[in-house]
Interface confidence: low
């Protein structure tokens, strides 16, 4: 009988694991893939039929300190004539990411992971029509 | 690392950057359960630049599943359901941070990893290059 492929068998804690104080975890902030860059098409936020603006929020006690949020410019979508078509809807597309927050209590510093919902851009959708009986 | 203002009366106050290794309380704040975008909205189907969601799975990562958007068409979908190739469906990309177990399999040791994900698609007017 063919034995199934075992992806990971890590039931015993490896001896090489670093010691971690109670109530916390060790986090290496040296980021894997630090230098990779977004390669989106140019100026899509202004060329989109559901265009958006960017707002940069900056917090020196957060990593990354800059978080960019998008806001849809219109409720409707831009048609071929460059006018807003309110029979369609511009809606935000969102993505969750982790951030690392640094907290100060007097001279002691603690670190906390947070999940942040980032609005990445907007897309044009057909509205959901609710028919009233 | 990032610069951090500190109380000048504290020891080592010249250390303004994030240390390379930190101990973190992993009570993740603001955590909600919208890890599956199919559950959170149906925009991927209703968009004029619709997309499919592909699952990227890695048990050594937190979260272990990340959804990648792939635009269904080169063009955009018109009101009649046909594709308009005078417009382009393009992916919207975002860098996100995830946790990677490092060393592998260790229970409470992680490293931050930056991942580039396509979150959805949007319909854009194409850039027209005029040839002289």
């Amino acid at each position: 009988r063919k034995i199934p492929k075992v992806g990971h068998t890590f039931f015993q804690k490896p001896e090489s694991c670093p010691p971690v104080p109670e109530g916390s975890m060790k986090l290496d902030t040296g980021i894997i893939n630090e230098n990779q860059r977004v390669s989106m098409s140019r100026n899509i936020e202004s060329r989109s039929t559901s265009p958006w603006n960017y707002t940069v929020t900056w917090d020196p006690n957060r990593y990354p300190s800059e978080v960019v949020q998008a806001q849809c410019k219109h409720l409707g979508c831009i048609n071929a004539q460059g006018k807003e078509d309110i029979s369609m809807n511009s809606v935000p597309i969102q993505q969750e990411t982790l951030v690392l927050r640094r907290k100060h209590q007097g001279c002691s510093v603690s670190f906390q992971l947070e999940k942040v919902l980032v609005t990445v851009g907007c897309t044009c959708v057909t509205p959901v029509v609710h028919h009233v009986q | 690392g990032i610069a951090i203002p500190r109380n000048s009366g504290c020891p080592n106050s010249e250390d303004k950057n994030f240390p390379r290794t930190v101990m973190v309380n992993l009570n993740i704040h603001n955590r909600n359960t919208s890890t599956n975008p199919k559950r959170s909205s149906d925009y991927y189907n209703r968009s004029t630049s619709p997309w499919n969601l592909h699952r990227n799975e890695d048990p050594e990562r937190y979260p272990s599943v990340i959804w990648e958007a792939k635009c269904r068409h080169l063009g955009c979908v018109k009101a009649d359901g046909n594709v308009d190739y005078h417009m382009n469906s393009v992916p919207i990309q975002q860098e996100i941070l995830v946790l990677r177990r490092e060393p592998r399999h260790c229970p409470n040791s992680f490293r931050l990893e930056k991942i580039l994900v396509s979150v959805g698609c949007t319909c854009v007017t194409p850039i027209v290059h005029h040839v002289a």
């Epitope: 199934p4 492929k5 075992v6 992806g7 990971h8 890590f10 039931f11 804690k13 971690v20 104080p21 109670e22 109530g23 916390s24 975890m25 | 309380n25 992993l26 009570n27 993740i28 955590r31 359960t33 890890t35 599956n36 199919k38 699952r55 799975e57 048990p59 937190y62 979260p63 272990s64 599943v65 990340i66 399999h105 229970p107 409470n108």
Partner: antibody
Framework: EVQLLESGGGLVQPGGSLRLSCAAS????????MNWVRQAPGKGLEWVST????????YYADSVKGRFTISRDNSKNTLYLQMNSLRAEDTAVYYC???????????WGQGTTVTVSS | EIVLTQSPATLSLSPGERATLSCRAS??????LAWFQQKPGQAPRLLIY???NRATGIPARFSGSGSGTDFTLTISSLEPEDFAVYYC?????????FGQGTKVEIK
């Protein structure tokens, strides 16, 4: 609505075999890791095995390693547990549980009873 | 493997009272800890994930707290349907492990 329905349990003699199935509906089955968890009569819960969404990663508890095999058929939305060389201590209610991306067992089936006795 | 110890084994309370259940881990599990409720003849139901987050559809009277090795499940005011067995479970390390359970019974 997420539904998980286990089947295949029954009475078997020590050394015998059984194959449990878990039929899933209400979610995209191939997108989620799945688990088997068991509960001996009057006892607590014990994790048995995990299989990732595409089946590339498989995990077993030491107590069943080499005897049990987890598998899945994503075209049939079904999870399986092949149990060989059964022992009296394998007697339990076996539950299948869906796993969220963030490692939570968010939905469970109602369980199927396996009794190993001579 | 990580051992989870729940206390007390049994909690005898009346409806309307506050229930406090404890779960202690043999080593830090960060906040990768969940709480489940199980009624006789039924499957477990996820109540709390990541130590303090209520799962979908779980009433606000259930709350979780703690991180590292010490965790608490609190039921602010017991309803008749809350009398059941409660299990904690960790996913910080393989294998996933459960506590032995705390039975909340009617006094």
């Amino acid at each position: 609505e997420v539904q998980l329905l286990e089947s295949g349990g029954g009475l078997v003699q020590p050394g015998g075999s059984l194959r449990l199935s878990c039929a899933a509906s209400g979610f995209t089955f191939s997108s989620y890791a799945m688990n088997w968890v068991r509960q001996a009569p009057g006892k607590g819960l014990e994790w048995v095995s995990t299989i990732s969404g595409r089946g590339g990663s498989i995990y077993y508890a030491d107590s069943v390693k080499g005897r049990f095999t987890i598998s899945r058929d994503n075209s049939k939305n079904t999870l399986y547990l092949q149990m060989n060389s059964l022992r009296a201590e394998d007697t339990a209610v076996y539950y299948c549980a869906k796993e969220e991306a963030t490692w939570d067992f968010d939905y469970w089936g109602q369980g199927t009873t396996v009794t190993v006795s001579s | 493997e990580i051992v989870l110890t729940q206390s007390p084994a049994t909690l005898s309370l009346s409806p309307g009272e506050r229930a406090t259940l404890s779960c202690r881990a043999s080593q830090s599990v960060s906040s990768f800890l969940a709480w489940f409720q199980q009624k006789p003849g039924q499957a477990p139901r996820l109540l709390i994930y990541d130590a303090s987050n209520r799962a979908t559809g779980i009433p606000a009277r259930f709350s979780g707290s703690g991180s590292g090795t010490d965790f608490t499940l609190t039921i602010s005011s017991l309803e008749p349907e809350d009398f059941a067995v409660y299990y904690c479970q960790q996913r910080s390390n393989w294998p996933p492990t459960f506590g032995q359970g705390t039975k909340v019974e009617i006094k």
